[in-house]
């Protein structure tokens, strides 16, 4: 099944998806799309890039905030809602037939826990849990390339995922906080 | 008003060849995928092929690999399925439908009766 | 290839009931499912597509549900135009497959 990846409403959810261009500079078309990754293309796509740049998104809430012309195509979706929810496909468009990288990823939107933070705990609570725990590491939710090798010289890093889930709990017992 | 408009179909003998056309209009041909399925009389549907956008990507179902050929000219916001060694097995209404995963709309359907 | 089965092969329904289509796949299509409807000597219509997202211009009274191998076509209040044949696809292994059909007939 889908690596799942959690982000509370109104934060900004983060999908990772990455390849790597050989030579690099040599980049290939990536799209993103709600839904599983169907047969073909992306299906309900929220983000299409070609060679060269990102050149159709359905929404400003979609980017590309890491180095995409570096292979990095991981998808941030801004101030999310309970609406984002759901299966996300990362297709990475690898040139000749069925050659494309196809990844899906879960998301998964969370209300914000109820927090009382006690009187000595001043910092803001987005900067007081910076860290994530990481549960494992997954190769590719699926990964089809049954076809002939593409023409240009394309190596496709392994895709990896980690589960990752915010440990607000944990934290906020550190910090004295309380829970409600 | 998006319309696909499917010609060609007709009688042919078994390994000749017919050449269906599909003319659309009123949308941007070159923004999408088109598709060819398949029904023959009193069956189900069955995909046939797929071009991408561009036509830089082209699909086949196994049974009629490397004996149809299909694409697109966006110049004349048409796509083609050549079908040559016709066998009676490809008897069918050909629809040409928009899209790759999912068909939406559909033509009326062209007869291909593959016959001595 | 993945083989989709569609239950019953005729339902008989009478006009203003409920009807309920099965559509079995043999392993997991996700939510990469949509449904057709034919009338005799027409062209296919499209329905509703990632399992249950109506396609533009179908009446709410039809609904899809379902994901992975398991879903369903509900009509809620059958009208006379509603008498077809309704069939299911999968879009999410290769090659694109086609249920045979389910024939929704007058009782």
């Known amino acids: 099944s889908e690596v799942e990846y959690i982000a509370e409403v109104g934060q900004n959810a983060y999908l990772p998806c990455s390849y790597t261009p050989a030579p690099p500079g040599n980049l290939v078309p990536v799209c993103w799309g709600k839904g599983a990754c169907p047969v073909f293309d992306c299906s309900n796509v929220v983000l299409r890039t070609d060679n060269r740049d990102v050149n159709d998104r359905t929404s400003g809430r979609y980017w590309l905030k890491g180095d995409f012309h570096k292979g990095d195509v991981s998808l941030t979706i801004e101030n999310v809602t309970l609406a984002d929810s759901g299966v996300y496909c990362c297709r990475i468009q690898i040139p000749g037939i069925m050659n494309d990288e196809k990844h899906n990823v879960k998301l998964v939107v969370i209300k914000p826990a109820k927090v009382t933070p006690a009187p000595t705990l001043q910092r803001d609570l987005t900067s007081a849990f910076p860290r994530m725990l990481t549960t494992g590491e997954h190769g590719p939710a699926e990964t089809q390339t049954p076809g002939s090798l593409p023409d240009v010289n394309l190596t496709v890093s392994n895709f990896f995922c980690e589960l990752q889930i915010f440990t607000l709990t944990n934290e906020l017992r550190d910090s004295g906080a309380t829970i409600r | 008003e998006v319309q696909l408009v499917e010609s060609g179909g007709g009688l042919v003998q078994p390994g000749g060849s017919l050449r269906l056309s599909c003319a659309a209009s009123?949308?941007?041909?070159?923004?999408?995928?088109m598709s060819w399925v398949r029904q023959a009389p009193g069956k189900g549907l069955e995909w046939v092929a797929n071009i991408k956008r561009g036509g830089s990507e082209r699909y086949y179902v196994d049974s009629v690999k490397g004996r149809f050929t299909i694409s697109g000219d966006n110049a004349k916001n048409s796509v083609y399925l050549q079908m040559n060694s016709l066998r009676a097995e490809d008897t069918a209404v050909y629809y040409c439908?928009?899209?790759?995963?999912?068909?939406?709309?559909w033509g009326q359907g062209t007869l291909v009766t593959v016959s001595s | 290839e993945t083989v989709m089965t569609q239950s019953p092969a005729i339902l008989s329904v009478s006009p203003g009931e409920r009807a309920t289509l099965s559509c079995r796949a043999s392993q997991s299509v996700y939510s990469n499912l949509a449904w057709y409807q034919q009338k005799l000597g027409q062209a296919p219509r499209l329905l509703i597509y990632d399992a249950s997202t109506r396609a533009t211009g179908i009446p709410a009274r039809f609904s899809g549900s379902g994901s992975g191998t398991e879903f369903t076509l509900t009509i809620s209040s059958l009208q006379s135009e509603d008498f077809a044949v309704y069939y299911c696809q999968q879009y999410n292994n290769w090659p694109i497959t086609f249920g045979q059909g389910t024939r929704l007939e007058i009782k």
């Open positions: 439908a928009r899209g790759s995963n999912w068909f939406d709309p």
């Open positions: 009123g949308f941007t041909f070159s923004s999408y995928w």
